[in-house]
C-alpha cells in the first residue's frame, strides 16, 4: 500500500451549458469547487484498480471527472468509454501532481456508463473506474405536509412524504391579515420537523425540495385530531 501512488478523484460541476460529447481535457472550464469522490482500491480485484464514488447527474448537466496523481516522474494515460479509446493529456499542477480530466458536457443517456482511466507511471500501472449515471427525476414527488403529535411530548411533528427528502420548516405568525405574508417581520421561520412551542395566530408547515414548495396550515381543530 505504501508503494502505491496517492490518488485523488474529484468531480467538478459546471454552470455553463455548452453542447458537446465527452472529451478528454487538461483544462476544465470555470466551475464550482471540486468534490472529493473517495477513490479507493477496489476490494478483491485483480490488478491495481481504484474506484471512485458512483456519480449521478441531471440530464444536460456538465461535469468534469478529474484524477490527481501523486507519483514521481512522468505519467501516460488512456481513457476508455464503451470500448472507445479517448486521448488523454496529463498536466502537472503547482504541487507537481499529475492531473487528468474528462469533461462531459451536456450529459445525455449515451454518455452514462463506466469511464476507465488507465495510467502508467514509472513505478506502476493502475486503473481508475468512474461510474456515471443519470438521475431519475421521474421518481421525484412533493407532497403536502401533514401533522402528528409526538408521543408523551407536548410537540408537533410535520411530515411530508416526498422524494428527494424535503427540508421542512414551520412558519409562525403572530398577527392577523396582510402582515402575515412571508416577508413580514411578524413571521418567524423554524427549519425543523418538530415544533415544541405552538404560538401565533397563523401556523403553517412547509416542505421544499427540487420540485418546489408545499405548505399546510394548522388549524386548532387539527390539534385534537393529530
Amino acid at each position: 500500500n505504501q508503494d502505491l501512488p496517492v490518488i485523488k478523484c474529484v468531480l467538478i460541476n459546471h454552470k455553463n451549458n455548452d453542447s458537446s460529447v465527452g472529451k478528454s481535457s487538461s483544462y476544465p472550464m470555470v466551475s464550482e469547487s471540486p468534490e472529493d469522490l473517495g477513490c479507493a482500491l477496489r476490494p478483491q480485484s485483480s490488478g491495481t484498480v481504484y474506484e471512485a464514488a458512483a456519480v449521478e447527474v441531471d440530464v444536460s448537466a456538465s461535469i468534469t471527472l478529474q484524477v490527481l496523481v501523486d507519483a514521481p516522474g512522468n505519467i501516460s494515460c488512456l481513457w476508455v468509454f464503451k470500448h472507445s479509446s479517448l486521448n488523454c493529456q496529463p498536466h502537472f499542477d503547482l504541487q507537481n501532481r499529475g492531473v487528468v480530466s474528462m469533461v462531459i458536457l451536456k450529459m445525455t443517456e449515451t454518455q452514462a456508463g463506466e469511464y476507465l482511466l488507465f495510467i502508467q507511471s514509472e513505478a506502476t500501472n493502475y486503473t481508475i473506474l468512474f461510474t456515471v449515471s443519470i438521475r431519475n427525476t421521474l421518481l421525484y414527488t412533493l407532497r403536502r405536509p401533514y401533522f402528528r403529535k409526538m408521543e408523551n411530548q407536548d410537540a408537533l411533528v410535520c411530515i411530508s412524504e416526498s422524494v428527494p427528502e424535503p427540508i421542512v420548516e414551520w412558519v409562525l405568525c403572530d398577527s392577523q391579515g396582510e402582515s402575515c405574508k412571508e416577508e413580514s417581520p411578524a413571521v418567524v421561520k423554524k427549519e425543523e420537523k418538530v415544533l415544541h412551542e405552538l404560538f401565533g395566530t397563523d401556523i403553517r408547515c412547509c416542505a421544499r425540495n427540487e420540485l418546489g414548495r408545499e405548505c399546510t396550515r394548522l388549524f386548532t381543530i387539527d390539534l385534537n385530531q393529530t
Partner: antibody
Framework: QVTLKESGPVLVKPTETLTLTCTVS??????????VNWIRQPPGKALEWLAH???????SYSTSLKSRLTISKDISKSQVVLTMTNMDPVDTATYYC????????????????WGQGTLVTVSS | AIQMTQSPSSLSASVGDRVTITCRAS??????LGWYQQKPGKAPKLLIY???SLQSGVPSRFSGSGSGTDFTLTISSLQPEDFATYYC?????????FGQGTKVEIK
Amino acid sequence: QVTLKESGPVLVKPTETLTLTCTVSGFSFNNARMGVNWIRQPPGKALEWLAHIFSNDEKSYSTSLKSRLTISKDISKSQVVLTMTNMDPVDTATYYCARIVGYGSGWRLLGDYWGQGTLVTVSS
Amino acid sequence: AIQMTQSPSSLSASVGDRVTITCRASQGITNDLGWYQQKPGKAPKLLIYAASSLQSGVPSRFSGSGSGTDFTLTISSLQPEDFATYYCLQDYNYPWTFGQGTKVEIK
C-alpha cells in the same frame, strides 16, 4: 480537503430532545453516492453505531434506538441532522459523524473521514 | 442484530511484537467488515475495509483477513504509535454493529 464537523448542545436535560448537526465540506450529497454515519461513544465504553443517511435518502437506524432517532440532510447547507428524543443520562457520550462512500460496483467505504466528535452530557 | 465479538478485550505487548486481534460475527457477513484504530480523546481512524483492503496511507504492517464469520487484524511489528484501542464494524446487515473493542497496551 474533506472535513466533517459536529455541532450541538453540550448539556441536555433528561426528557429533552437532542439535535446534532454534521456540517461537511470537500464533498457533497449532490452528485456522488455519499452518506454520513452517526456513531456515539459513552465515556470509557465502546463505539455504538446510531444511524446513517445516503445521498439518495436511503437511511437506517440502530434497532434499540430507532423509535427515538431521526436523521435528515440538507444538501444546500451540506448538513446532516440527527435528532434524539427523550434523552436520558445514559445517553451521555461523544457523538461522531463519519463519511460513507458508495461505489458503482456495489461496495462501500465506511469512515474514511470522521469529525472530531462532540461530547453531550445529559443531566438535570 | 448481528453480534460482533472481539477477542481479546485487552492485551499487553512490546514494540516489535506480532499482534493478532480477532472478531467473530454471530452470522455470516461475507467480507463486509472494517477495522478502526482509536487513541484516547481522538476520533477513530479507518485501517482496513472489506476485511482485507488496506486504507490509503495506513502502514503495511497492518493487515486484515477472514471472510464469513471469522476475521483477524494483524500488526506484524508493533510500533510505539500503535498502542490504542481497535474496533471491528460490520456493514453487511442493518443495524451496523461494532465489536466491543480490544485495547493494546504496553507490556
